[in-house]
Amino acid sequence: SGTTNTVAAYNLTWKSTNFKTILEWEPKPVNQVYTVQISTKSGDWKSKCFYTTDTECDLTDEIVKDVKQTYLARVFSYPAGNVESTGSAGEPLYENSPEFTPYLETNLGQPTIQSFEQVGTKVNVTVEDERTLVRRNNTFLSLRDVFGKDLIYTLYYWKSSSSGKKTAKTNTNEFLIDVDKGENYCFSVQAVIPSRTVNRKSTDSPVECMGQEKGEFRE
């Protein structure tokens, strides 16, 4: 059932990385527009992206107010040019999203190797502490500020001359690894939240190799 020429949204999907969170849906509108509402389980509905012809809505500003809440969104369909029109039940046609809990589900963004420094047969590799869109006292919090001990990093490293990879883990943003003197190594890191059941790992960082400008060498 529904209003003439109006179809309900479907395939409502949350796309979220480091808490930047967008709701996407189908279909591309033909003679209709959409409005999105978002709510916590116990809260009131808040409308966003009014009468849009887009099939996505950025809900980041709402979810970063409390990333540990569980959110539900719904997408309303209205006939273009007649947004007062309602469905057969006296309400606009709408579809609910799956529930979304940002703290447990947001994807971890691709990390970046900030620097590496070799001293003799040791290399210190430092990972950039990525900024999120979660605020505290008007400053953006880092991934570590939000996740704390839940967040670890895995380092993959290998000799430039071979393909055999070694791994190391840290619950800080620094690794101190042993290397063979005179050999060049390449590095890639991954952010991991071991306590999660979904979206536990980020994609690997871009590879950085010794002998390139990010690194420093000291005898």
Partner: antibody
Framework: EVQLVQSGAEVKKPGESLRISCKGS????????IEWVRQMPGKGLEWMGD????????NYSPSFQGHVTISADKSISTAYLQWSSLKASDTAMYYC?????????????WGQGTLVTVSS | DIVMTQTPLSLPVTPGEPASISCKSS????????????LTWYLQKPGQSPQLLIY???TRSSGVPDRFSGSGSGTDFTLKISRVEAEDVGVYYC?????????FGQGTKLEIK
């Protein structure tokens, strides 16, 4: 209002099993770590372990690993601490606590404690 | 495990006077990525559950009076009470909130002279 309500005092004999509970309310139970802390009579605080109810992931202090089990039932917002075989040295006050909103920001809310007495 | 060492273990104070408690950790609690120190302070009043006073070494928890302040970095930390009141009596604990297992100091008992 955030609340952690713990089960009542228990008196047990050595070798018996026990499960005590901690029910959370006033917040999203699945996204905050529940911590368990022991305080033996007249002594200080000892961290035992914790659980993230949303995933069931646990961490234990090496001092308690293998002697206690931490679990949670997110459908009723309750975390548990259990022993399969109690010892007299388990006599203590046991507190549950909830982690803070930010990472590594302390144990922001505490239950009232459950006194466990183990004596033959 | 990180060992937390508090001094003094007993602290008799006259009401209205300042008080200071030291806490030293066996490893640095400073996280270089965001320059935060993951050191927490609690107060356990007689017959009560502990309560959070300060996290991130210097951030007061909501509702904690501003006479309480935390400072320090790395391995050396201090909790100060600018003017002690009768209700501040109890045992103060510092805690490593940086690394598992999360260890507590042995406690400092503040009493009124």
């Amino acid at each position: 209002e955030v609340q952690l309500v713990q089960s009542g005092a228990e008196v047990k004999k050595p070798g018996e099993s026990l499960r005590i509970s901690c029910k959370g309310s006033g917040y999203t139970f699945i996204t905050y770590w529940i911590e368990w802390v022991r305080q033996m009579p007249g002594k200080g605080l000892e961290w035992m372990g914790d659980i993230l109810p949303g995933s069931g992931s646990t961490n234990y202090s090496p001092s308690f690993q293998g002697h206690v089990t931490i679990s949670a039932d997110k459908s009723i917002s309750t975390a548990y601490l259990q022993w399969s075989s109690l010892k007299a040295s388990d006599t203590a006050m046991y507190y549950c606590a909830r982690s803070g909103y930010y990472g590594n920001s302390g144990f922001a809310y505490w239950g009232q404690g459950t006194l466990v007495t183990v004596s033959s | 495990d990180i060992v937390m060492t508090q001094t003094p273990l007993s602290l008799p104070v006259t009401p209205g006077e300042p008080a200071s408690i030291s806490c030293k950790s066996s490893q640095s609690l400073l996280y270089s990525g965001n320059q935060r120190n993951y050191l927490t302070w609690y107060l356990q009043k007689p017959g009560q559950s502990p309560q959070l006073l300060i996290y991130w070494a210097s951030t007061r928890s909501s509702g904690v009076p501003d006479r309480f302040s935390g400072s320090g970095s790395g391995t050396d930390f201090t909790l100060k009470i600018s003017r002690v009141e009768a209700e501040d009596v109890g045992v103060y604990y510092c805690q490593n909130d940086d690394t598992y297992p999360m260890t507590f100091g042995q406690g400092t008992k503040l009493e009124i002279k």
